[in-house]
Interface confidence: medium
Amino acid sequence: LEVQVPEDPVVALVGTDATLRCSFSPEPGFSLAQLNLIWQLTDTKQLVHSFTEGRDQGSAYANRTALFLDLLAQGNASLRLQRVRVADEGSFTCFVSIRDFGSAAVSLQVAAPYSKPSMTLEPNKDLRPGDTVTITCSSYRGYPEAEVFWQDGQGAPLTGNVTTSQMANEQGLFDVHSVLRVVLGANGTYSCLVRNPVLQQDAHGSITITPQRSPTGAVEVQVPEDPVVALVGTDATLRCSFSPEPGFSLAQLNLIWQLTDTKQLVHSFTEGRDQGSAYANRTALFLDLLAQGNASLRLQRVRVADEGSFTCFVSIRDFGSAAVSLQVAAPYSKPSMTLEPNKDLRPGDTVTITCSSYRGYPEAEVFWQDGQGAPLTGNVTTSQMANEQGLFDVHSVLRVVLGANGTYSCLVRNPVLQQDAHGSVTITGQPMTFPPEA
């Protein structure tokens, strides 16, 4: 019995559903009562899902698998794996037995896009040409491990004093921190590129340093000029710093973080102690760094509703304040493509192609292209619906008259993460069914 599976690994984004395709050719008169179908992990032989004695025996794999029962009789033995995790990566074997027996293994490659890198500079005050600084490029919650490249403002590689560490969290996703130690010139741009080798996704950040003396006078409060970009569910640091004078003690410090627009109190440090979070118990100060002038705020488990401007007020003898913007983001899933009608297609038929991508933020930009990269802007309807967490599901529908053959591709862009997710469908001129049979 010939069992067919894809040669290439199935790539699935963490948190999305994956289909492990497997098919066989049923003979005339075949009935499901004759079928024994077993999915198992190739290496450990752990049972994943089975269909025997004419019925679905269900999932033996964390209740996250399902068969396409209505398609089994046509020879479609594919397995749907829901809410993919890093731990799912590996090889799955599809065993099919009717009278004869056959099996084949399909690989699942799990992936997660890296966030747009955040760049930090240490020290970040009173910088002069010739000073040695440490620039840290941090990108979060990606998989598999990233490749990191540094460049200067003219594209020249900076490979000298670079240390890159990658730490997996409890879900197996990596946070990458790459540290470049460099001697400042008169001015310079330092850029870090974080590549996901499976998704071939590049995320990059850069920082431009112009050494100069800081002005004197009132307390100078420094925050990043660019918005802090934080992925939903991760922790964000809203950086804020001041320059303590010699002899400064925390008893002199009044530090208040508040929402810029509503003036709602977020966190405070007064009378020599941390007054705690006034913002859903999700904020914290870096108390051990306060005396050195680090007034940054840690915001935990970021939500869409946290997006906006936060003001950092610092009062010692003098007073100063500055506002930092928090931009919340979530990557869009790889689009799934559906075609209607999807059988017996011929040139001249009008079809509706739907491109769906899930749980991203902010709203996506959607672009359609043909197989030569030419935009398809004609009959396109795109809808974006926010769920209860404020994350968007995007559905873009292209209505098109089929030519002799053609590729229709949809690109879903997250404008904040500069993350592109794309899907495509190729329709040939012969009468055909979509998706093509394995």
Epitope: E147, F149, Q151, G153, Q154, G155, A156, P157, T159, G185, A186, T189, S191, L193, R195, P197, D202, H204, S206
Partner: antibody
Amino acid sequence: EVQLVQSGAEVKKPGSSVKVSCKASGYSFTSYTIHWVRQAPGQGLEWMGYINPNSRNTDYNQKFKDRVTITADKSTSTAYMELSSLRSEDTAVYYCARYSGSTPYWYFDVWGQGTTVTVSS
Amino acid sequence: DIQLTQSPSFLSASVGDRVTITCRASSSVSYMNWYQQKPGKAPKLLIYATSNLASGVPSRFSGSGSGTEFTLTISSLQPEDFATYYCQQWSSNPLTFGQGTKLEIK
């Protein structure tokens, strides 16, 4: 039109030096780095080094570090490459090229026409 | 140094053929550029950042790859495509080119 125009062919004796010029026009000379690449007869391309005309920072291929000097004159939008202690294996066509693009993707988009340097006793 | 090894070094093909040139890096690079050179002329940019077509380059040229393996594909050879092709990286010093692939008429 963006152009890099190089000086003419040179014939030199072993042990001497050669200085090749590369005049830029049609763009802001200080906005891009100028690189020098050479190609020996029937061989591939070999990078020698570059200069940032704005900061005058240079970086060289270690292979040539002790023999090559790249300079730039902002007032005339001209870059120069001087190679000293010439030997017969330095016989090659020498190209200047502009390294263009933007972070993080860069490439040589404009090349000079090439200068043939022949080293022969 | 990162060595770039192109294969094949020589390739004979006919007009209309689909050809693929591979460039392998001795360690991972951030992206690859590709150039075309004709005898007596300076190189010309074809593909930048692995897969982006340079301005004015016909769409029959395409690039792909990541990490250590990159490819340049010409989908249907035209008479003017017979030339030498070079890959180039600058992820670490020194900037390096592949040794070249000479594409000749069969």
